[in-house]
Each structure stands twice: as structure tokens, then as C-alpha cells.
């Protein structure tokens, strides 16, 4: 039975040209995390594999940095980066957990971070 929950940074906003940390956290389970995929709609940004390290998609290699931890840092933000991001946790023995983050990239200099929230 899958007992875990994914906690994410929720709905967040950031300034154009700036950077943002996409972060998810898996709690309430003793399952072992074997891999985390970071995806934007149907595009792969990066994979963090517990054995192998990081695979950064070449399309994003100049703008994506691994970490902190299992998170992902998105740099040189553009308005086109606005949208949904997913952290997909592959775990043993539970299976797959998915978290969602919505990022809004703003033209203005006022960009406030949304509250953290949980996805069961």
C-alpha cells in the first residue's frame, strides 16, 4: 500500500531572468527512492538516479542545475517557462509518486512564492 505523500513548493512565481528552485519531498513512507524524474508537460528536464547521479536533458543543460538534494534549479527564466512541472518519485517497494508545481514567470520585479502544499 502506498502511504507516502509528496510535499512540493506548490504554486510559485519568479522574475524573468532570475532563477528558481523546484523542490519536492516524499514523506510518510519508508520506501527507498530509486529515481526522480523532473518533467515539464511532456518534456524531460532531468533525472536523478540514486545509483548513477544526474542526467540533464541537453535541451536544458545551459539553464538547469542539479539540486539542492533531489530538487532542480531553473536559471535564466523566461516567460515561456511558465507552466506545470512534475517531480516523479520512483520508489521501492511503493511504486511511483507524483508531485506538481506551477511556476509563473513574471515580467515585473514583484514575484512572491506561493505556500507549500501537499499532494497525497
Amino acid at each position: 500500500m502506498m502511504t507516502g505523500t509528496i510535499e512540493t513548493t506548490g504554486n510559485i512565481s519568479a522574475e524573468k531572468g532570475g532563477s528558481i528552485i523546484l523542490q519536492c519531498h516524499l514523506s510518510s513512507t519508508t520506501a527507498q527512492v530509486t529515481q526522480v524524474n523532473w518533467e515539464q508537460q511532456d518534456q524531460l528536464l532531468a533525472i536523478c538516479n540514486a545509483d548513477l547521479g544526474w542526467h540533464i536533458s541537453p535541451s536544458f543543460k545551459d539553464r538547469v542545475a542539479p539540486g539542492p538534494g533531489l530538487g532542480l534549479t531553473l536559471q535564466s527564466l523566461t516567460v515561456n517557462d511558465t507552466g506545470e512541472y512534475f517531480c516523479i518519485y520512483h520508489t521501492y517497494p511503493d511504486g511511483t509518486y507524483t508531485g506538481r508545481i506551477f511556476l509563473e514567470v513574471l515580467e515585473s520585479s514583484v514575484a512572491e512564492h506561493g505556500a507549500r502544499f501537499q499532494i497525497p
Partner: antibody, heavy 127, light 112 residues
Framework: QVQLQESGPGLVNPSQTLSLTCIVS??????????WSWIRQHPGKGLEWIGY???????YYNPSLKSRVIISVDTTKNQFSLKLSSMTAADTAVYYC???????????????????WGQGPTVTVSS | EIVLTQTPLSLSVTPGQPASISCKSS???????????LSWYLQKPGLPPQVLIY???NRFSGVPDRFSGSGSGTDFTLKISRVEAEDVGVYYC?????????FGGGTKVEIK
């Protein structure tokens, strides 16, 4: 010499789920140097990559099929499997399993070519 | 996804003559680690594909030295220096630098 052998039905009813298994012999699926893939080939057409699994369970699926695909691994049986749901006539194809090499360096990893392939059963979707 | 375009679609070659197949990528396959993950496969009639070349120019174990690969960026080439009867089949290029893995449409090689 590593060999791959697919097993599963040759005929699937429309709307049903295809289940295929790839048995690995002559080597361990637990080797960290490889990823394990499924590829299909429609009659008289080119090759379409379905997705991969690593021995510890990490996967990535082709976005074009991801809503219908599950790839799993059973290290105790030295095999990995494909499930493709909601089958239609457009899913009629030869389904291959294959082994690919992983290059890992300095905290990063990369996917190299597919060096061992199964024989590939033809799967027909028809009632 | 990265689209690979192969030319020509088919090729009819006299035994002993050279052959060349082109594979062009929709975006640069610039390596992240000083390697470019572009490989070549031959699918003989009724059989699964078999790897010939990996990482652009490295011949796989047991592949005859008449096969060679070259290229960088978006343009890659497979050359057969002297075609033999056993070389007939469909040749595919494949990129694995970016997921999903993608294949070229294939080039059918026949003997005249």
C-alpha cells in the same frame, strides 16, 4: 553472451492490455551498466522507442505512449516486462526488448546505444 | 523530441562498390561529456536490428572494418567502403543523447 527472449501473446483483443516479458539470460539484469528498453516496429515501418527501466526500478516512457505504458522489472527472475493498455489496431507491431549501455561519469550519466536485442514477437490486435 | 532524417530512402549498390548513408538531426547532438550518442543499426530481413556503430564512430565488436561512422553536430554519415551481399537490409541511425530515444526513418540497401 547475454541473450534476450520476449514472451507473450501474439493476438490481443481491442481495448485489452498487452503484457510482454523479456527474459535476460547469460548475464544479470542487476548490472548497473545497462538500461533495459522496449521498442516496437509497425508492419513495414521504422522503429519506435517505448521506454526504459533501470534495474532498481527507475523508468522513463516515450511521451507519445506514456499514458498507456507500464514497464516493470523483476530482478529475482532476471526479467523485465511491458504492459500497454487500451490496445487498438494501430498497436499491431513487432515488439522488441533491448539492452542499452549507460555511461556514468563525475556524478552524471548518459544513455548509449542498444547492443543486444530480442527476436521480437509480432503482436496483432484483432477481435 | 529530436527528429532524425535519413537519406537516401533506398540505395542499390554493385558489390565491391562504396555506399554512404546520411543522418541529419533536427537539433545539434552536442555532447555533454565529450561524447555524442549517435549509433547505427542494420536490420536484415526477418531479424531484429543489430548495432554496427556506437558514439558516432566506434565499431561494435565483430563488425567488419568496411563499416565506418563520422559526423558531428547535426550531420552524421555511415559509410560502407565495399558493399557485400550480406550487407543488404535496412540501416537506421538512433540518437540517445536526449530522451525519448529516436530513430531515423531507415535506408534500404539492395544489391544490384
Amino acid at each position: 553472451q547475454v541473450q534476450l527472449q520476449e514472451s507473450g501473446p501474439g493476438l490481443v483483443n481491442p481495448s485489452q492490455t498487452l503484457s510482454l516479458t523479456c527474459i535476460v539470460s547469460g548475464g544479470s539484469i542487476r548490472s548497473g551498466d545497462y538500461y533495459w528498453s522496449w521498442i516496437r516496429q509497425h508492419p513495414g515501418k521504422g522503429l519506435e522507442w517505448i521506454g526504459y527501466i533501470y534495474y532498481s526500478g527507475g523508468t522513463y516512457y516515450n511521451p507519445s505512449l506514456k499514458s498507456r505504458v507500464i514497464i516493470s522489472v523483476d530482478t529475482t527472475k532476471n526479467q523485465f516486462s511491458l504492459k500497454l493498455s487500451s490496445m487498438t489496431a494501430a498497436d499491431t507491431a513487432v515488439y522488441y526488448c533491448a539492452r542499452g549501455s549507460i555511461a556514468a561519469r563525475s556524478g552524471y550519466f548518459y544513455f548509449s546505444g542498444l547492443d543486444v536485442w530480442g527476436q521480437g514477437p509480432t503482436v496483432t490486435v484483432s477481435s | 523530441e529530436i527528429v532524425l532524417t535519413q537519406t537516401p530512402l533506398s540505395l542499390s549498390v554493385t558489390p565491391g562498390q562504396p555506399a554512404s548513408i546520411s543522418c541529419k538531426s533536427s537539433q545539434s547532438l552536442l555532447p555533454s561529456d565529450a561524447k555524442t550518442y549517435l549509433s547505427w543499426y542494420l536490420q536484415k530481413p526477418g531479424l531484429p536490428p543489430q548495432v554496427l556503430i556506437y558514439e558516432v564512430s566506434n565499431r561494435f565488436s565483430g563488425v567488419p572494418d568496411r563499416f565506418s561512422g563520422s559526423g558531428s553536430g547535426t550531420d552524421f554519415t555511415l559509410k560502407i567502403s565495399r558493399v557485400e551481399a550480406e550487407d543488404v537490409g535496412v540501416y537506421y541511425c538512433m540518437q540517445s543523447i536526449q530522451l525519448p530515444l529516436t530513430f531515423g526513418g531507415g535506408t534500404k540497401v539492395e544489391i544490384k
